[in-house]
């Protein structure tokens, strides 16, 4: 028995006609099975295969090779969270966080907790002590004075 065009199988009771549109992106093999075009998958070949490495949790795509990030995520693979706007010396594990790096504090991690180490403000052999965020105190050697032992 020879089947009509696009019909396959015993009794010609299987149909497959290649298509490339909203309903699917596939060709047909010699048995009438849908074979997805490159970049497509799923029973009807209408799900795009995203960029390799695209986060399955935070990225998606409607076109093959794409990787569109969910709100709050960024990067080529949508695997990097977006920190709180204005976060200076901080990182995030989840979107909009601002987790401060060592020696930084404040809501935006913009307050230096180690002003002495970062700026070394004490001159002429003065000893620096961190007294609070962005605050320090210099103990000046004999013969020197001023906030930074500059006098």
């Amino acid at each position: 028995v020879t089947c009509d065009d696009y019909y396959y199988g015993f009794g010609c009771n299987k149909f497959c006609r290649p298509r490339d549109d909203f309903f699917g992106h596939y060709a047909c093999d010699q048995n009438g099975n849908k074979t997805c075009m490159e970049g497509w998958m799923g029973p009807e070949c209408n799900r795009a295969i995203c960029r390799q490495g695209c986060s399955p949790k935070h990225g998606s795509c409607k076109l093959p090779g794409d990787c569109r990030c969910q709100y709050g995520w960024q990067g080529l693979y949508c695997d990097k969270c977006i920190p709180h706007p204005g976060c200076v010396h901080g990182i995030c594990n989840e979107p909009w966080q601002c987790l401060c790096e060592t020696n930084w504090g404040g809501q935006l991690c913009d307050k230096d907790l180690n002003y002495c180490g970062t700026h070394q403000p004490c001159l002429n052999g003065g000893t620096c002590s961190n007294t609070g965020p962005d605050k320090y105190q210099c103990s000046c050697p004999e013969g020197y004075s001023g906030p930074n032992c500059e006098i």
């Epitope: 019909y7 149909f15 309903f23 029973p43």
Partner: antibody, heavy 116, light 107 residues
């Protein structure tokens, strides 16, 4: 087994909106599109639109463009059809159906009556 | 949009008769045509898809033929349970329009 279970009958006033749900079971929800079809009393079948359950993309018949919104909630395997600015001519049984090669599975239908 | 012209709109026949319903489309839809049977108060039931493939569980007295623009549903020997309304529908492109229906009544 595959089942599509729709929400109950609705009585609405002209100008109002109605939202009909269609909860599916027995297969992977995002593997198949959901279509919405309606049938006015004593009339034929009228195709309203389709929603791709994986992406949430929908396509509507021109007649309903601007008045219909089809959505899905993949966490509950439920499709929704909302029709706004209702008029008496929208009185009909609304069906959801699953398919690509015709509709092998249908919901039981939801009667929406629009009357003042 | 693709227009679907189904004929006849109603038909009286007797048990054992051979019945043919036709569906014509305004443009080539290849074999993207489906036939449904609907009984009062019930959702439609799929009979035939892709013009001639019988859905599982559908009796072999139902058959479909055609491609392109002209399609036929044939019931070879009417049974009492076959009295219902029949619809064709294309699923080639959006919108998936239905034919107007054929009401099959007992003569």
């Amino acid at each position: 087994q595959v089942q599509l279970v729709q929400s109950g009958a609705e009585l609405k006033k002209p100008g109002a909106s109605v939202k009909v749900s269609c909860k599916v079971s027995g297969y992977a929800f995002t593997d198949y599109a959901i279509h919405w079809i309606r049938q006015a009393p004593g009339q034929g079948l009228e195709w309203m639109g389709i929603i791709n359950t994986y992406y949430g993309d929908s396509k509507y018949a021109q007649k309903f463009q601007g008045r219909v919104t089809m959505t899905v909630d993949t966490s509950t395997s439920t499709a929704y059809m909302e029709l706004s600015s209702l008029r008496s001519e929208d009185t009909a049984v609304y069906y959801c159906a699953r398919g690509y090669d015709g509709f092998a599975y249908w919901g039981q239908g939801t009667l929406v009556t629009v009357s003042s | 949009d693709i227009q679907m012209t189904q004929s006849p709109s109603s038909l009286s026949a007797s048990v054992g008769d051979r019945v043919t319903i036709t569906c014509r489309t305004s443009e080539n839809i290849y074999s993207y045509l489906t036939w449904y049977q609907q009984k009062p108060g019930k959702a439609p039931k799929l009979l035939i898809y892709h013009a001639k493939i019988l859905d599982s569980g559908v009796p072999s007295r139902f058959s479909g033929s055609g491609s392109g623009t002209d399609f036929t549903l044939t019931i070879s020997s009417l049974q009492p349970e076959d009295f219902a309304t029949y619809y064709c529908q294309h699923h080639y492109d959006i919108p998936w329009t239905f034919g107007g229906g054929t009401k099959l009544e007992i003569k």
